[in-house]
């Protein structure tokens, strides 16, 4: 349905307040170093001209694509250049090529201060003084600071920060009220936004199809009484909607997603009794509701997939007619049958499908050579089960921090050209899967634990893309993104490293570690102990083990020391010369 | 969509030869193996014979063995069946079809041996 003006069509169809923040997500997403005033003051400028083309769509410019307003509008910036290089050039091309560009410049690890906390009473001042300004500053820090973070999610975030400073500012102890609340919201909002970075990356990576498969297994497996033709129509949009918001198109985007919603809440008889109570909430609960949902409960009867998918003589035929939809129907059969399976497995039983299907009905006999296929899949569904187990009973037995530990030593082992901080941001994230995931029953894990090591090491992947080191991390990133987990899996010690220069200063540690909260100091520790790995990566557990039990022991006495400083400084000395004698250096 | 279009068929006398053939079109024709079928009247569908993808590997039902050659030109889509020696228990209608599917397609080209 075209419409003469697109601003106009998308500022009314939003309202103003969803406009104007959506526009400013927009531009923090593709600017991120650009100060909050200035942004203000261009979101002010296209709200602005929204409001004269809805007076009158023929008005000059209404006619204009979204693109083009914005991009001309971010082009406007004076100090484009001296701020952001080479991204200028972007003002130079053409739509749709100008977008393509600012798209590209997106940094995944922007340059920016850590956002730091004020005290409860100086946020409740400012959130008193100026309510708008203070919740669009909040926009502003988490889209500059995460630039694929689904634009309609930040918007119920931002409704939730508003929420707990609107309660909390007026309690007792304001801060026994809003800290908890504002430390979810921070954890919550780094998964989603890591989530989101995933959906992106398979967009933009590995194309639609890629995408397409992986909602067809999600929701197959969130809605098994929905038909195919259901479960298609939703991923179909769902696909319209991320590719929207991945591409920049924010408007776009959370308008589609509001439509979705509303359908999915029309038609829920037809796709899942667990919504009822989603579809009863406002439009941005809903929406994230809708999303988070429990699977439904299987039909009951659901026949054996070989009738269809193995003994059936018109595999073949079906398969020739439509490729897309017969592997569609088969990842839809499969997963509505297997919520405990991850969707990552899913996906990779239909390759192996697709994959002795493109051979076998190539043969003269085509039943003869598939019909063993199934027999293919038992070793790919146990490989997880598998590691899941192993990685579970050690996280049992050390508990999380020991477990990240283990997990930093591993990948370092495996990677060591890629950066400290990455390594050690990455494995303190791949060791969360033990306390996110290892609680739950056999049926849960795997799809709560491989879904979610996708995300974790899909940050690995962005961040590795911007700075190149390792061949083995581009290798497992792009080939293919439904074998990273196997892939990353499978690597063994790089033998072709050169060990690390020993350098005293990466282990010099001052009386400020003393004063850390317990993540902070857990993260110097992980810190030193990947540097230790970088410089002796042949080093056994049982080395690495002793030597961070004495750096513990140091730290923990040092902080009680009465000159800490003194004490960092000649105790540090010895334990550098103790770890040095104690791996070899 | 996917057309499978027979020709060929016709009447013929005992020891006489016909070449069917079969026009694909709406899918990758290179990238399957086909096979014919045939139904006399009253009967149920019987397999007669099917190829791999590149033509490489031919297959027969033991009741058309060294009479009948099954044969395709991937560069026009095309499947082939040559029939020697022919004899009244051949006549039925021949279909093609993908893989060895049992559904029927296409009409089918009607081969009647008779004298």
């Known amino acids: 349905d075209a419409h003469k003006s697109e601003v106009a069509h998308r500022f009314k169809d939003l309202g103003e307040e969803n406009f104007k923040a959506l526009v400013l997500i927009a531009f923090a997403q593709y600017l991120q170093q650009c100060p909050f005033e200035d942004h203000v003051k261009l979101v002010n400028e296209v709200t602005e001209f929204a409001k004269t083309c809805v007076a009158d769509e023929s008005a000059e410019n209404c006619d204009k694509s979204l693109h083009t307003l914005f991009g001309d509008k971010l082009c406007t910036v004076a100090t484009l250049r001296e701020t952001y290089g080479e991204m200028a050039d972007c003002c130079a091309k053409q739509e749709p090529e100008r977008n393509e560009c600012f798209l590209q410049h997106k940094d995944d690890n922007p340059n920016l201060p850590r956002l730091v906390r004020p005290e409860v009473d100086v946020m409740c001042t400012a959130f008193h003084d100026n309510e708008e300004t203070f919740l669009k500053k909040y926009l502003y820090e988490i889209a500059r600071r995460h630039p694929y973070f689904y634009a309609p999610e930040l918007l119920f975030f931002a409704k939730r920060y508003k929420a707990a400073f609107t309660e909390c500012c007026q309690a007792a102890d304001k801060a026994a009220c809003l800290l908890p609340k504002l430390d979810e919201l921070r954890d919550e909002g780094k998964a989603s936004s890591a989530k989101q970075r995933l959906k992106c990356a398979s967009l933009q990576k590995f194309g639609e199809r890629a995408f397409k498969a992986w909602a067809v297994a999600r929701l197959s497996q969130r809605f098994p009484k929905a038909e195919f033709a259901e479960v298609s129509k939703l991923v179909t949009d769902l696909t319209k909607v991320h590719t929207e918001c991945c591409h920049g198109d924010l408007l776009e985007c959370a308008d589609d997603r509001a439509d979705l919603a509303k359908y999915i809440c029309e038609n829920q008889d037809s796709i899942s009794s667990k919504l009822k109570e989603c579809c009863e909430k406002p439009l941005l609960e809903k929406s994230h509701c809708i999303a988070e949902v429990e699977n439904d409960e299987m039909p009951a009867d659901l026949p054996s997939l070989a009738a269809d998918f193995v003994e059936s003589k018109d595999v073949c035929k079906n398969y020739a007619e439509a490729k897309d939809v017969f592997l569609g129907m088969f990842l839809y059969e499969y997963a509505r049958r297997h919520p405990d399976y991850s969707v990552v497995l899913l996906l990779r039983l239909a390759k192996t499908y697709e994959t002795t299907l493109e051979k076998c009905c190539a043969a003269a006999d085509p039943h003869e050579c598939y019909a063993k296929v199934f027999d293919e899949f038992k070793p790919l569904v146990e490989e997880p089960q598998n590691l899941i187990k192993q990685n579970c009973e050690l996280f049992e037995q050390l508990g999380e921090y020991k477990f990240q530990n283990a997990l930093l030593v591993r990948y370092t082992k495996k990677v060591p050209q890629v950066s400290t901080p990455t390594l050690v941001e990455v494995s303190r994230n791949l060791g969360k899967v033990g306390s996110k995931c290892c609680k739950h029953p056999e049926a849960k894990r795997m799809p709560c634990a491989e879904d979610y090591l996708s995300v974790v090491l899909n940050q690995l992947c962005v961040l590795h893309e911007k700075t190149p080191v390792s061949d083995r991390v581009t290798k497992c990133c792009t080939e293919s993104l439904v074998n990273r987990r196997p892939c990353f899996s499978a690597l063994e010690v790089d033998e072709t490293y050169v060990p690390k220069e020993f350098n005293a200063e990466t282990f010099t540690f001052h009386a400020d570690i003393c004063t850390l909260s317990e993540k902070e100091r857990q993260i110097k520790k992980q810190t030193a102990l990947v540097e230790l790995v970088k410089h002796k990566p042949k080093a056994t557990k049982e080395q690495l083990k002793a030597v961070m039990d004495d750096f513990a022991a140091f730290v923990e006495k040092c902080c009680k020391a009465d000159d800490k400083e003194t004490c960092f400084a000649e105790e540090g000395k010895k334990l550098v010369a103790a770890s040095q004698a104690a791996l070899g250096l | 969509e996917v057309q499978l279009v027979e020709s060929g068929g016709g009447l013929v006398q005992p020891g006489g030869s016909l070449r069917l053939s079969c026009a694909a079109s709406?899918?990758?024709?290179?990238?399957?193996?086909m096979s014919w079928f045939r139904q006399a009247p009253g009967k149920e569908r019987e397999f007669v014979s099917a190829?791999?993808?590149?033509?490489?590997?031919?297959r027969y039902a033991e009741s058309v063995k060294g009479r009948f050659t099954i044969s395709r030109d991937n560069s026009k889509n095309t499947l082939y069946l040559q029939m020697n020696s022919l004899r009244a228990e051949d006549t039925a209608v021949y279909y093609c079809?993908?893989?060895?599917?049992?559904?029927?397609w296409g009409q089918g080209t009607t081969v009647t041996v008779s004298s």
């Open positions: 190829i791999d993808s590149g033509g490489a590997d031919t």
């Open positions: 709406g899918f990758t024709f290179g990238s399957f193996g």
């Open positions: 079809t993908i893989g060895r599917s049992a559904s029927r």
